[in-house]
Interface confidence: low
């Protein structure tokens, strides 16, 4: 006769492991008992259980409640056992020794491999600001057994670097994603992808990139200078910029206070019916937590009674 078993049994942490051992004997041969033991090199064999043909399953105190026979129907030549709720410490070599008559004893070994799926974590780097050089955007760490694979899925251009730390029964892998921040990266997803044989599918953690910036400021509303004449209604100046975080706007007049009746509504400066009193230099001040910008314009309200042309100067400063 001969023993049938597996070279390797692989389970995920917490699953039940079936340790197979089947004696394929000749006609008339019988199995008296099957003994299961840990057989790791350098350690003495530690018995898990003994399946006796007459007296049933005996379990070592160290494995009480964790070793069972497979559910019926059972073949009397089947010495397989179930190891419940596999933990990392169960990983290693196991030996099944089958005592038969009249053929004698047979033994076989298998290796139990316990996969420990990783629990990845993603840590964003420092605040990203436009104008920085190569900067850490995020790091992703996953620990498991065997070592997991950590990669990145993103449309953003960047560089990755990985390092691994081996522990006694597992390995931790950390991957970092570096980039040169630019405003076009705002809102872009950066996804850490962790692969591992103990996972049914890759684990993904997504981080949304936020890059602080402030665009140059400019003022709209003076494109047609002929519209800025005494009596005109609905005249307005609009300050244009964009940023992350979204900027706030403030209007001032360089050569004095804002004239009465002039309304400030965020990025827009609204004028009452124009008079020559509204002529002057207006400054839009744009700011966010990252930076601030100024843009100033000169308004010259034309009085048709004075036959003089309107001068318009645009100046942008930051």
């Amino acid at each position: 006769g001969e023993l049938e078993t597996s070279d390797v049994v692989t389970v995920v942490l917490g699953q039940d492991a079936k340790l197979p051992c089947f004696y394929r004997g000749d006609s008339g041969e019988q199995v008296g008992q099957v003994a299961w033991a840990r057989a790791d090199a350098g350690e003495g064999a530690q018995e898990l259980a003994l399946l006796h043909s007459k007296y049933g399953l005996h379990v070592s105190p160290a494995y009480e409640g964790r070793v069972e026979q497979p559910p019926p129907p059972r073949n009397p030549l089947d010495g397989s056992v179930l190891l419940r709720n596999a933990v990392q410490a169960d990983e290693g070599e196991y030996e099944c020794r089958v005592s038969t008559f009249p053929a004698g004893s047979f033994q076989a070994r298998l290796r139990l491999r316990v996969l420990v799926p990783p629990l990845p974590s993603l840590n964003p780097g420092p605040a990203l600001e436009e104008g920085q050089g190569l900067t850490l955007a995020a790091s992703c760490t996953a620990e498991g057994s065997p070592a997991p694979s950590v990669t990145w899925d993103t449309e953003v251009k960047g560089t990755t670097s990985s390092r691994s730390f081996k522990h006694s029964r597992s390995a931790a892998v950390t991957s970092e994603f570096h980039l040169v921040p630019s405003r076009s990266m705002n809102g872009q997803p950066l996804t850490c992808v962790v692969s591992h044989p103990g996972l049914l599918q890759d684990q993904r953690i997504t981080h949304i990139l936020h890059v602080s910036f402030l665009a140059e400021a400019s003022v709209r509303g003076l494109e047609d200078q002929n519209l800025w004449h005494v009596g005109r209604e609905g005249a307005m100046l609009k300050c244009l910029s964009e940023g992350q975080p979204p900027p706030s706007y403030n209007w001032t007049r360089l050569d004095g206070p804002l004239p009465s009746g002039v309304r400030v509504d965020g990025d827009t400066l609204g004028f009452p019916p124009l008079t020559t009193e509204h002529s002057g230099i207006y400054v839009c001040h744009v700011s966010n937590e990252f930076s601030s910008r100024d843009s100033q314009v000169t308004v010259d309200v034309l009085d048709p009674q004075e036959d003089s042309g309107k001068q318009v100067d645009l100046v942008s400063a930051s």
């Epitope: 078993t5 597996s6 070279d7 390797v8 990983e91 290796r111 491999r113 065997p146 044989p197």
Partner: nanobody, 118 residues
Amino acid sequence: EVQLVESGGGLVQAGGSLRLSCAASGSISSINLMGWFRQAPAKQRELVTSISPGGSVRYADSVKGRFTISRDVAKNTVDLQMNSLKPEDTAVYYCAAESERTYYFDSWGQGTQVTVSS
């Protein structure tokens, strides 16, 4: 480090046969299991069969009775005889070796394409 080189892939009609071979070199003394994996388009890589140094074998249910793995420990080769091929056997086949130091398949061949036409 173990190097693995496969050969023998190709195009075959359904019901036909192919034989894949894999030669190992390098740190062969550390090899424990050797096996064949396959990966079809848009699918996970799966273990087809593996064999121990002593000749104990294991097969995926989908190939039992059709595929046979053999190993020549002296020559450091492992072969896969594939009979009664089906279109669903179409995949890239990879030879793999398991190191007794790491306890998982950590050496891989470059892969060989097997295409089974109906």
